[in-house]
Structures are given as C-alpha cells and as structure tokens.
C-alpha cells in the first residue's frame, strides 16, 4: 500500500494532509522538510562557522528531536547525522521498510507473497480468524453470532465452539432437540433426530408423541392369513391358522411338510404360536 506521506518526508519535521504530501512544520523547509529555515542559505547546517556564512541563528543539532524513525538511533557526523536502523528498516532516517517474505513478516500462520504493487514489498494472506497487514489482529469471530438458538460462542483460537442451551445441539446449536431433552420419550421410547426436527420411536405397546399412550399391539391386525393376535407383556403373539407359520403367519406350510422357510427355528414346530419380539 502506498505510504501516507511523501517518501523520505522527515518524520520529525514534516506531515501531510493528503497522501503523498510533505508539508513542513514551522522552522523547516525543503521537499522533505529536512532543512532548518534559519540555515537553509548557509554552507554549514550548524556550528561556529554559521556566523561567518550569514546565518544569524544557529540551527538545531542534527540529532535534535531524533530524526531516525522506526526506533532507529541517531549519531552525529561532522556534517550531518547517521541513523542506525533496526532490522527490517533502512534509508537515511530508517523510514524505508525493507521487510520481505524472507523476514517472515506474517504472523499466526499467514502466507507471505511478494506484492504485485511496486510499492508493496509483500502481502500476507491471513488464515481464518486473523486480519491486518501482518495477520497480527485476531478477528472477533463471535461478533458474527454464529451460534444459533441462543447458544454461547467460545473462540478457542484454533476453532469456534458453541455451548448450546438445553434442547439444542449441533456445531452451531442448529438442531432443536427440545422435546427429547430430559428423556422426553416415555416408556423406553428413543428420540430420533432428523432434518432438524425430532420424533419419538416408541417401544411396542406404546404410542403417541411422547410414547405415553398405551397402544393395542393387535389393533393393526398384524397376523396374516387369519392368524389370531394375542397381546403379551413383551409384545404380541400370533396363533396361526392351519397351513401357515412364521412370526406373523406369513409363510404357508407345504403339503409335503416342507415350508417356504429354510428351516424352523430350534424348539419350534410349524403351526406353533410365534412370539414377535
């Protein structure tokens, strides 16, 4: 991204109101605001010789106000000053960022690529959850309110977690389990989730939304071929008519004694009542 002020603009004595400008504070002049007004026509910027070159007021020392930006340290030289710049900066006043991808400027696992803009040395592509030119800022992912149905959002850094209210489930608390909460399916029924809704799968002999209603297992006439249905504490029993067998009397017994079943279960003869478990 372009620098805000004109490149090289003195960070101490210049400022800008428009991008690219370098406007000088009082007492300073020049394209980069590096020249003290009182000495701009002098051969020497300061010191005893100033009086002999027509300068009435000696200018400030080269290191006055520390002209070195970005934490650089200033040392005076016979005619000017010198900045010792910290790693990653260079230029007369340490104003130039020399950081490249080789310096590893992208934090939090950001991917560094060389900038397409000639004035941009690198660009960080940030991983989810981070932003800023160096991926240094954590995105407040919870501010997007990802947890539904009043769930509490927890940003764990590596992932988001939703702590769901009772009756809701799913990564974002999107499933409404309200009627299943607290064993809402009675009499041994089990709660089945499906498509964000729920239902109770009831044990035999029970029905209704919550499996609270007692059901007649023989009401649906489950025994085929004229078999007689008997309600039993653990289910229903079909007493088959002659010539039929099976839990629901669904298999005919052939005249030669063979049946359509591969074999009768051990301990059971064809024609015996079959318990449906």
């Amino acid at each position: 991204a372009p620098l805000v002020c004109r490149a090289g603009c003195s960070p101490e004595h210049g400022f800008c109101e428009q991008p690219g400008e370098c406007r000088c504070l009082e007492g300073w002049t020049g394209p980069l605001c590096t020249v003290p007004v009182s000495t701009s026509s002098c051969l020497s910027p300061r010191g005893p010789s100033s009086a002999t070159t027509g300068c009435l007021v000696p200018g400030p020392g080269p290191c006055d106000g520390n002209p070195c930006a970005n934490g650089g340290s200033c040392s005076e030289t016979p005619r000017s000053f010198e900045c010792t710049c910290p790693r990653g900066f260079y230029g007369l006043r340490c104003e130039v960022s020399g950081v490249t991808c080789a310096d590893g400027p992208c934090f939090n696992g950001g991917l560094c690529v060389g900038g397409a803009d000639p004035d941009s040395a690198y660009i960080c592509h940030c991983p989810p959850g981070f932003q800023g030119s160096n991926c240094e800022k954590r995105v407040d992912r919870c501010s997007l309110q990802p947890c539904r149905n009043g769930g509490l959002c927890l940003d764990l850094g590596h992932a988001l977690r939703c702590r769901c209210r009772a009756g809701f489930a799913g990564p974002r608390c999107e499933h409404d389990l309200d009627d299943c909460a607290g064993r809402a399916c009675a009499n041994g029924g089990t709660c089945v989730e499906g498509g964000g809704a729920h239902r109770c799968s009831c044990a035999l002999g029970f029905g209704g939304r919550d499996c609270r209603e007692r059901a007649d297992p023989c009401a649906a006439r489950p025994c085929a071929h004229g078999g007689r249905c008997y309600a039993h504490f653990s289910g229903l029993v079909c007493a088959c008519a002659p010539g039929y067998m099976g839990a629901r009397c669904e298999f005919p017994v052939h005249p030669d004694g063979a049946s359509a079943l591969p074999a009768a279960p051990p301990g059971l003869r064809p024609g015996d009542p079959q318990r449906y478990l």
Partner: antibody, heavy 119, light 107 residues
Amino acid sequence: QVQLQQSGGDLMKPGASVKISCKAAGYTFSNYYIEWVKQRPGHGLEWIGEILPGSGSTTYNEKFKGKASFTADTSSNTAYMQLSSLTSEDSAVYYCARWGAREPGFPYWGQGTLVTVSA
Amino acid sequence: DIVMTQSQKFMSTSVGDRVSVTCKASQNVGTNVAWYQQKPGQSPKALIYSASYRYSGVPDRFTGSGSGTDFTLTISNVQSEDLAEYFCQQYNNYPLTFGAGTKLELK
C-alpha cells in the same frame, strides 16, 4: 507495473502554447507527485516543478514560473504541463517522472516529448 | 539554488575497469542525493537514492557514497552497457537540481 506514457512531439510557432500530457498506470495516481523535467542538448536536466494530483498542489522552479503550468485529471490518471509564449529556448525534450514511494527520487520516467519551436 | 557540480564532463574507461563519478553540492544536502543513467535517445534511469541505496533492479556493481557536499557513484567491473551519461540530483532543497552530467566513454 508503474508506467508513464507521454504525448507525441510537436513543432510549434514562437509565441504559441503547447500542452503535454503524461498518462499514468499501475499505481494510485492521486498519491504521488508527478515531476516535470526539461532537457536541452548541452544543458543537462532541469527540474521545472511538480504536482500532487490528489490535492492539485504544485511547486514550481522560480525559473519556470509564468512559463509552465501543471494540471492533473484524476479521472483519467493524466497529468498535463502547459508551456506558454514559446520561444526557441523552449525547444527541448520534456519528461514527466514519478516521485518514489519507498525510494525517494525519480524512479519512474515517461519516454519524453520533443517540443520544437521554429518560425 | 543548490548547484550540483560534476567536474568531469567526460571519463574514459575500459570494460572490466572500476570508475568513480563525482558530484559536489554547493551546500550541505545531507544524503538526499540520487544518481541517474541516461543513454542516447532514452529517458534517464534511476540508479541510486539517499546517496547510497540502489533502486530495485539495479546491478550491485553500482554503488553510491558520500554525505553533506561530496558524493561519488562507483561502477566496478564496467560493462559495455554502462557506457552512458550519469547525472547526480539533490532533493534536499527546492528547486530540485541536477548536475550537468558525466559521459562515460570507452578508452
């Protein structure tokens, strides 16, 4: 990448005016000074002045005040220099250049526009 | 105005030589000096800024030095493509001013 494309050369009559254009591409035009430089054989390079397109603020070399005037059109990313009351002394190649961003000075230059003033 | 004096209008050199082009400012300009190379019929090309920093893409055989009033552009291991005119420029004070140029020629 940064590119500066200048208008073609002109043969002008003394006393006339000429307007040279410099079309910029590859960067944010508003944010960087466009510099204007004159070059005559045997006279080296002379800085005429500069304009910051975003604000329209200009700085002229005293020597060229009244001779050159700068404008910029941010909608077309084009800077202009008008030279008035032309004389044979104004016959020269005129360059536009762009001030550096991280690197002070004139790292980017147009190809130059030759202005010839002759009766 | 600050006068940038390039005392040598011409310098002779051979391929592989080391050559130094000098520039003297009429007053202290800190290190706010740039160097440019220009070949006949071409626009100037930026080489050095802040007296000693190479612009991107400039071969490292070009080095700049100096501060205050005395500046030098050194070309080590001169190549045939380096035969051109070299200008110094100060951007410490308005108006920005250039040296008159030094033309590098083959011996």
